[in-house]
Amino acid sequence: PRNDTCPELPEIPNGWKSPSQPELVHGTVVTYQCYPGYQVVGSSVLMCQWDLTWSEDLPSCQRVTSCHDPGDVEHSRRLISSPKFPVGATVQYICDQGFVLMGSSILTCHDRQAGSPKWSDRAPKCLLEQLKPCHGLSAPENGARSPEKQLHPAGATIHFSCAPGYVLKGQASIKCVPGHPSHWSDPPPICRAASLDGFYNSRSLDVAKAPAASSTLDAAH
């Protein structure tokens, strides 16, 4: 054997090295990789050093027996059957309340003949639940509402008015407050007749004092 090179590097079971026929001189870098379904244990990169020894021990290829962590899903919690996700492990995603699951709720780690174990599905998504609209309120008797729709989206406002001769008692505008369920901010108003009693009670009457009576009346009177 030459004394100016590093020792030959062997092939490893269930893997290969590149380059496959390396020069074994100082500075040469050799990378080991594993076949699908196997992972490198140890250092995958070896370098021929000044002293003509390899920088690391020879790695090995070990069968992959678990799935990768499928990760968290925003707006959800997850329940895990085994922390290292071995074959047969399950992960359940439950969306936070107010969110809807799109995809598969439960993932299972399956073994494959060729290649690493794989999840039964990709992680789901949790999408914001649609807010329900408010149901239309009927117009008050002797009044009107606008817009005149059966359903009003969350956040919408409706306005009320009364016919001539009627006054509005309550809120003139009410809002569909977003929520689960969405709800009206106030009860609908009513239209009350604007009575004469009400008219006079709300005003003070000023009476001017008449001048003293005289026997003759001015032509102007």
Epitope: H75, S76, R77, R78, L79, I80, S81, T90, V91, Q92, I94, D96, Q97, G98, F99, I106, E129, G179, H180, P181
Partner: antibody
């Protein structure tokens, strides 16, 4: 409807571990997740974690990771919670409950007292 | 985590009186749930999904709210309503409970 039967009260020494049980009867055990909730002397309630009896999946409140270990035995319709390295802070009533986003059914609670 | 603040902490009401207690969240939540607990017993689900009454809950109870502000109302107080009421959300992890409102009979 499901009923949840919890194990009896426990008087424990500081540093010890305690394991309590929650047995379900009256409905399909695997239809619901089982949750554990702590109620301390101040009466506040804290969620510890949950287990899905069907798949054995477990989720914890980060605060109780390392303190509580949840397990389930599907064959006996029983959930378990072990608390380790007990201190006086762990003295409380521990409830199991069933549900998804709220707790429909509650057990009667297991009282744990930690005292030297 | 979301903090739920219940107020008042303690309140008392006369028979027939209308009672309202509130639960305020530190961030917006989608739904609120309420539990009733009487001394020495476990909590009972009382109102769920903000406004739905659990089975067996009298119709004098109601719940409403959205965003960060929720409330439980009893239209006419009765002796059997004296208890502690807790609110709870699960709009993010972990779920949390309020510290409770203790309702006493005058």
């Amino acid at each position: 409807e499901v009923q949840l039967q919890q194990s009896g009260p426990e008087l424990m020494k500081p540093g010890a571990s305690v394991k309590m049980s929650c047995k379900a009867s009256g409905d399909t055990f695997t239809d619901y997740n089982i949750h554990w909730v702590k109620q301390n002397q101040g009466k506040s309630l804290e969620w510890i974690g949950e287990v899905n009896p069907n798949i054995g999946g477990i989720g914890y409140n980060q605060k109780f990771k390392g303190k509580a270990t949840l397990t389930v035995d599907k064959s006996s319709s029983t959930a378990y919670m072990e608390l380790r390295s007990l201190t006086s802070e762990d003295s409380a009533v521990y409830y199991c409950a069933m549900g998804r986003w709220y707790f429909d059914v509650w057990g009667a609670g297991t009282t744990v007292t930690v005292s030297s | 985590q979301i903090v739920l603040t219940q107020s008042p902490a303690i309140m008392s009401a006369s028979p027939g009186e209308k009672v309202t207690m509130t639960c305020s969240a530190s961030s917006s939540v989608s739904y609120m749930h309420w539990y009733q607990q009487k001394s020495g017993t476990s909590p009972k689900r009382w109102i769920y999904d903000t406004s739905k009454l659990a089975s067996g809950v009298p119709p004098r109870f109601s719940g409403r709210g959205s965003g960060t502000s929720y409330s439980l109302t009893i239209s006419s107080m009765e002796a059997e309503d004296a208890a502690t009421y807790y609110c709870q959300h699960w709009s993010s992890n972990p779920p949390t409970f309020g510290a409770g409102t203790k309702l006493e009979m005058k």
